[in-house]
Amino acid sequence: DVERTTCPPEKEVHEIDESLIFYKKRELEACVDAALLAAQMDRVDAIPFTYEQLDVLKHKLDELYPQGYPESVIRHLGHLFLKMSPEDIRKWNVTSLETLKALLKVSKGHEMSAQVATLIDRVVVGRGQLDKDTVDTLTAFCPGCLCSLSPERLSSVPPSVIGAVRPQDLDTCGPRQLDVLYPKARLAFQNMSGSEYFVKIRPFLGGAPTEDVKALSQQNVSMDLATFMKLRREAVLPLTVAEVQKLLGPHVEGLKVEEQHSPVRDWILKQRQDDLDTLGLGLQGGIPNGYLILDLSVREALS
């Protein structure tokens, strides 16, 4: 923390301007009134403060707003946002997408994924749900940021908004997030024809259950291998060789390269070797011919 000193009369600050860049840390601390700083935050970003000086300004705002900054201040943080920790941001209440845009622009090119994720979370909380305008802002200013939201936050996305989500926005989404988004996408695209539906639903399929994957295998979709590899392991394991062959179409030839990778490896282990041989790829590791498969989990459930 900056040591307290008295402000020399000739250094008293009546407005936030460029002259402050010549102030030492302790002079800034002593001479800048926190309320004045807050009122003139829109000027701060135009002044080339050092990182050390920004630390002092942040400290002043923290003292003035121990419960979190008001949005009027947050909107004009500019490069001061780079000094914020996720803990700081967690105290904020943000509803304006202009604020979100401004801070996303500032964070670009900086290692601030945790801060950005927390900021987006605060915006969703502040606005009550992840509406279309918020999604549009995220996809435009922060591709991939949608996946920084928790499954709980994503559950507030109305299905009508799903159409605004692009495939690249889902690249970093984990299984739990896709589990939330997939049913919404299914609902959003339910009135589309087969091929159009598949194109739209494909980025969300990492959250699809087995029955939906099986249904797709009956629709001549020719799922590409990259999409297949992103399916939930639990959704792939119950598929038969015939279903996988139908699901992938010509893409089934790519299974050979993925033979050692999940979920293909795990799926192979559950198939009869005879059935795997019909794929014509020399896939190995299936259940040998003549072996009996006992599903002990069923017996345990009954006892």
Epitope: D224, L225, Q245, P250, H251, E253, G254, K256, V257, D277, T278, L279, G280, L281, G282
Partner: antibody, heavy 121, light 107 residues
Framework: EVQLVQSGAEVKKPGASVKVSCKAS????????MHWVRQAPGQGLEWMGN????????YYNERFRSRVTMTVDKSTSTAYMELSSLRSEDTAVYYC??????????????WGQGTTVTVSS | DIQMTQSPSSLSASVGDRVTITCKAS??????IAWYQQKPGKAPKLLIH???ELQPGVPSRFSGSGSGTDFTFTISSLQPEDIATYYC?????????FGGGTKVEIK
């Protein structure tokens, strides 16, 4: 040593069909799909389609779908490509090719010597 | 389908020259491109796969680079035996496609 040996040159009349064979040896025939590629005189290479030698399931290039039939005979490790309703533009060298599944869908590491098909009235 | 645009369609160079051929894919194919050499009356011969991996026995003067949509094949010092037509092949999609070919001649 892997070898793909194709049938000899053919001369056909427009409207006729031609069936080219490709006998594989030196590897397990049912472990690699067989592909067919053609090359018209002075032109580039054109992928026609492929076939799963284990279950006989083919996938064709849309351009040939209505006229091409690919089959296999597992007992002799032979793949066949039949092209019907021949026209002069089908005059070409037809190759069978075996992929190596090193990455993605596999690149062709072994080729037949080619079969010249001439369509002329 | 993925289109492969290869250029130039032909080139003439002197022995010892550096020769460069490019292939442009109509969509991202990662690094799934192979390069072939074909001499008159012969089947294509695999030189390079996965953009830059040289096949065993292929001289080191042949090389490849690129990723995504733009790829380059280079002969660092052209030799008389390199007179042939060269083709790129994309195998990022099961429906394979070749470039139009580049005929390399000696000046």
């Amino acid at each position: 040593e892997v070898q793909l040996v194709q049938s000899g040159a053919e001369v056909k009349k427009p409207g006729a069909s031609v069936k080219v064979s490709c006998k594989a040896s030196g590897y397990t025939f049912t472990n690699y799909w067989m592909h067919w590629v053609r090359q018209a005189p002075g032109q580039g290479l054109e992928w026609m389609g492929n076939i799963n030698p284990s279950n006989g399931g083919p996938y064709y290039n849309e351009r040939f779908r209505s006229r091409v039939t690919m089959t296999v005979d597992k007992s002799t490790s032979t793949a066949y490509m039949e092209l019907s309703s021949l026209r002069s533009e089908d005059t070409a060298v037809y190759y069978c090719a075996r992929p190596y599944y090193g990455s993605s869908y596999g690149y062709f590491d072994y080729w037949g010597q080619g079969t010249t098909v001439t369509v002329s009235s | 389908d993925i289109q492969m645009t290869q250029s130039p369609s032909s080139l003439s160079a002197s022995v010892g020259d550096r020769v460069t051929i490019t292939c442009k894919a109509s969509q991202d194919i990662n690094k799934y491109i192979a390069w072939y050499q074909q001499k008159p009356g012969k089947a294509p011969k695999l030189l390079i796969h996965y953009t830059s991996e040289l096949q065993p026995g292929v001289p080191s003067r042949f090389s490849g680079s690129g990723s995504g949509t733009d790829f380059t094949f280079t002969i660092s010092s052209l030799q008389p035996e390199d007179i042939a037509t060269y083709y790129c092949l994309q195998y990022a999609n099961p429906l394979r496609t070749f470039g139009g070919g580049t005929k390399v001649e000696i000046k």
